[in-house]
Amino acid sequence: SEVEYRAEVGQNAYLPCFYTPAAPGNLVPVCWGKGACPVFECGNVVLRTDERDVNYWTSRYWLNGDFRKGDVSLTIENVTLADSGIYCCRIQIPGIMNDEKFNLKLVIKPAKVTPAPTRQRDFTAAFPRMLTTRGHGPAETQTLGSLPDINLTQISTLANELRDSRLANDLRDSGATIRIG
């Protein structure tokens, strides 16, 4: 039932998670862990914030957004296939067992082979038939028609459009958003 997010080997992955602080600067501790959210705390913690700052992080894991405004989305730098799996964003709301927990599934795909533009045959062999894009929700898949019907310029343009739309969607995906207070 986890929401699925995708990235390619070598890219940065983005796992969205948000909350709305009750008042400016009134922050809630958050932890990110590898693996589904356990009953308490986070397992295999990769990053943690407290009421003021990021107080624990490991290499390649960082918060790119303004966590002081409740954007605690996780960026994983230069991903490898080993980064695939479930990640837990846990918003540690004051109280007894009151935390908000979000399990996000990260799927890492092998890097696409860059085509050599002068050789149609090599491009056709290397270019995948399925291009994956990210909409405002779980991963969607767009299918290219039969490759012989599309010329190199069209494919190049389509690939650029898909890349641009993915980058745009990555900036603000349908992440978990909650209001505190």
């Epitope: 039932s1 959210c37 009953v39 007894i96 009151n98 908000e100 978990a176 909650i178």
Partner: antibody, heavy 113, light 107 residues
Amino acid sequence: QVQLQQSGAELVKPGASVKLSCKASGYTFTSSDINWVRQRPEQGLEWIGWIFPGDGSTKYNEKFKGKATLTTDKSSSTAYMQLSRLTSEDSAVYFCARGLDYWGQGTTLTVSS
Amino acid sequence: DIKMTQSPSSMYASLGERVTITCKASQDINSYLGWFQQKPGKSPKTLIYRADRLVDGVPSRFSGSGSGQDYSLTISSLEYEDMGIYYCLQYDEFPLTFGAGTKLELK
């Protein structure tokens, strides 16, 4: 605001089963724990079990294993507790709670022939 | 299972009096202790979490303290609306366990 609305009072016969409901509103149902607690007449509070609606994982008090079954329906933001093989000892008020901070109003279960 | 021993089981106190209720765990619960107030026919209300942190909206006359196995709830100056039954709860590990309760009545 967070609200938990529990189903109405039940009168059932010994040996039967009953399914109590707890409808959540005012928060993201799939992201927060639900606990169930029993209170027998003139007695204290007993923890029955826990469920996380996000993935359906559960924990039970050993005392209630085989007696209580916890489930959720994400589409209606409702948590359920089924109680089976009922006896008069199961007569009590049953509470659901988000975490243990926001409580439902309780459902009174009476088991009597 | 962790056993929570709460005392006293009942007590009488006067308005304005300082009241203390204690709870002892059968093992260290790492301050994962909560206090609840319950009035007749009502759901429990959370007062304190993590042993000493007051829930938003709870009057400041309530306070919690303790660590390890020993914890207490104090009402600095008793008011009429504080009458009811008080329960402690450990949530350090499953199964979660409550104390037997302390019935607080007006002297």
